[in-house]
Interface confidence: low
């Protein structure tokens, strides 16, 4: 590529809107999935809008497996928080499943077949990493 | 983006090596899948190397569904041909499944869980579109 041009996203990532997404090919617990994303200068998936949710639902429509996202909470009395500490906006989606369970490792959210579920963070699942797309020439 | 810079691949496509790949979110027969790719200025997946195969196997590792690729043959006495008319290189992979079956619509190849299978082209499946990445400034 010409030197002053930079791709919006690295190879193997999907560019959508302002972000790049990588669907993991390995199955890990939530913390390891988070570390994997961090090693790629990214974070676990954060859904900011219904448009984001629509895209992700479409992107995983051909999978029946669960994917960790960057949403977790310490116990049922705590709010669902994204990795950056911001709360889940209730109009986006409702977390289903084991929402009132308490796990020593915390409760983490995964997306599967378009719905979001609560589960023990220690379980292994695929994951979705996300980082800002490079939308300027470098 | 700066005017003289063009992304290697459009949004929602995955850039890998010299190509862009799009995993369909809808399920169609082989011919309709081919038309869908053509409408996006692309073709159905063509695997040219073991590296290509490794990438595709990794990219669909979290799906248990079949994906049409651009490989078909009229009947068992014909060779497997890619859409551009080139033959399947035997060292790449072996087509499994209904290889000796004859179907009115022809026999088409799909990839599922890393292996390639023969099936009736009239059946519905997901698909993978592919086109050349734009690796130069425009």
């Amino acid at each position: 590529r010409v030197a002053n041009c930079s791709a919006p996203c690295p190879q193997d990532w999907i560019w959508h809107g302002e972000n790049c997404y990588l669907f993991s090919s390995g199955s890990f617990n939530w913390e390891n999935s988070q570390e994997k994303c961090l090693s790629l200068d990214a974070k676990l998936l954060k859904i900011n809008s219904t448009a984001d949710l629509d895209f992700i639902q479409q992107a995983i429509s051909y999978s029946s497996f669960p994917f960790w996202m960057g949403l977790s909470r310490r116990n049922p009395s705590y709010p669902w928080l994204w990795e950056d500490g911001s709360p889940l906006m209730p109009h986006l989606f409702r977390v289903r499943g084991a929402v009132s369970q308490t796990y020593p490792s915390g409760t983490c959210a995964y997306i599967q077949r378009g719905a979001v579920y609560a589960e023990n963070c220690i379980l292994a699942a695929f994951s979705i990493c996300q980082k800002k797309a490079n939308l300027r020439a470098q | 983006r700066v005017a003289n810079c063009s992304a290697p691949c459009p949004q929602d496509w995955i850039w890998h090596g010299e190509n862009c790949y799009l995993f369909s979110s809808g399920s169609f027969n082989w011919e309709n899948s081919q038309e869908k790719c053509l409408s996006l200025d692309a073709k159905l997946l063509k695997i040219n190397s073991t590296a290509d195969l490794d990438f595709i196997q990794q990219a669909i590792s979290y799906s248990s569904f079949p994906f049409w690729m651009g490989l078909s043959r009229r009947n068992p006495s014909y060779p497997w041909l890619w859409e551009d008319g080139s033959p399947l290189m035997p060292h790449l992979f072996r087509v499994r499944g209904a290889v000796s079956q004859t179907y009115p619509s022809g026999t088409c190849a799909y990839i599922q869980r890393g292996a390639v299978y023969a099936e009736n082209c009239i059946l519905a499946a997901f698909s993978i579109c592919q086109k050349k990445a734009n690796l130069r400034a425009q």
Epitope: N75, S77, L81, Q101 | -
Partner: antibody, heavy 129, light 111 residues
Framework: QVQLVQSGAEVKKPGASVKVSCKVS????????MHWVRQAPGKGLEWMGG????????IYAQKFQGRVTMTEDTSTDTAYMELSSLRSEDTAVYYC??????????????????????WGRGTTVTVSS | QSVVTQPPSVSGAPGQRVTISCTGS?????????VHWYQQLPGTAPKLLIY???NRPSGVPDRFSGSKSGTSASLAITGLQAEDEADYYC???????????FGGGTKLTVL
């Protein structure tokens, strides 16, 4: 600091409806989850319903479902609780209350953790023929 | 009958320590939902005393403390004072009822 100002006392006949208001100041209503709690004379506190951050909607205690409606007028930052088909057992003080007011979080999701730290003074509703 | 149980009354002399228990189940306190405690003086609205099991809002004396274990929680008041005479309520969330629940209340009498 959040303050909740409730409407005045009401006397109603059995079968009628009552609508109690609760005006928020110091915050906007959309930043808070409003709940309604009642207390019959000489009895304990009874949760009637309120905004649930998990669902992003108002939920009602099973006992009151079908009889109670909780609404919000965000233009005036006022919450309302309407109870229909009144009977003598509904004679009580009705409180509006919100979590996380004093904590200043302004984040509805913290409700389960903070408890209801700001209360209105209560509205006495008497149901008598 | 409340799904969260408190003793109807407790009493203690000034300066003494008293505890009030709050017993729930696996669908509320035992499910991990936090417990909050309220104090209600006669003729006034309830006041939050303890939130999140053991945290005191600003202005609440450190004579009041809360704890939680398993399916139950307790409120402890040390150095009992005459002005502590009031009704005390615990509260949690119940996932099977999909709503908040209060204990039946405990009347504290300072002898």
């Amino acid at each position: 600091q959040v303050q909740l100002v409730q409407s005045g006392a009401e006397v109603k006949k059995p079968g009628a409806s009552v609508k109690v208001s609760c005006k928020v100041s110091g915050y906007t209503l959309t930043e808070l989850s409003m709940h309604w709690v009642r207390q019959a004379p000489g009895k304990g506190l009874e949760w009637m319903g309120g905004f649930d951050p998990e669902d992003g909607e108002t939920i009602y205690a099973q006992k009151f479902q079908g009889r109670v409606t909780m609404t919000e007028d965000t233009s005036t930052d006022t919450a309302y609780m309407e109870l229909s088909s009144l009977r003598s057992e509904d004679t009580a003080v009705y409180y509006c209350a919100t979590p996380n007011g004093q904590q200043g979080k302004g984040v509805r999701g913290w409700d389960y953790y903070y408890g209801m730290d700001v209360w209105g003074r209560g509205t006495t509703v008497t149901v008598s023929s | 009958q409340s799904v969260v149980t408190q003793p109807p009354s407790v009493s203690g002399a000034p300066g003494q320590r008293v505890t009030i228990s709050c017993t729930g189940s696996s669908s509320n306190i035992g499910a991990g939902y936090d417990v909050h405690w309220y104090q209600q003086l006669p003729g006034t609205a309830p006041k939050l005393l303890i939130y999140g099991n053991s945290n005191r809002p600003s202005g609440v004396p450190d004579r009041f403390s809360g704890s939680k274990s398993g399916t139950s929680a307790s409120l402890a008041i040390t150095g009992l004072q005459a002005e502590d005479e009031a009704d005390y309520y615990c509260q949690s969330y119940d996932s099977s009822l999909s709503g908040w629940v209060f204990g039946g209340g405990t009347k504290l009498t300072v002898l």
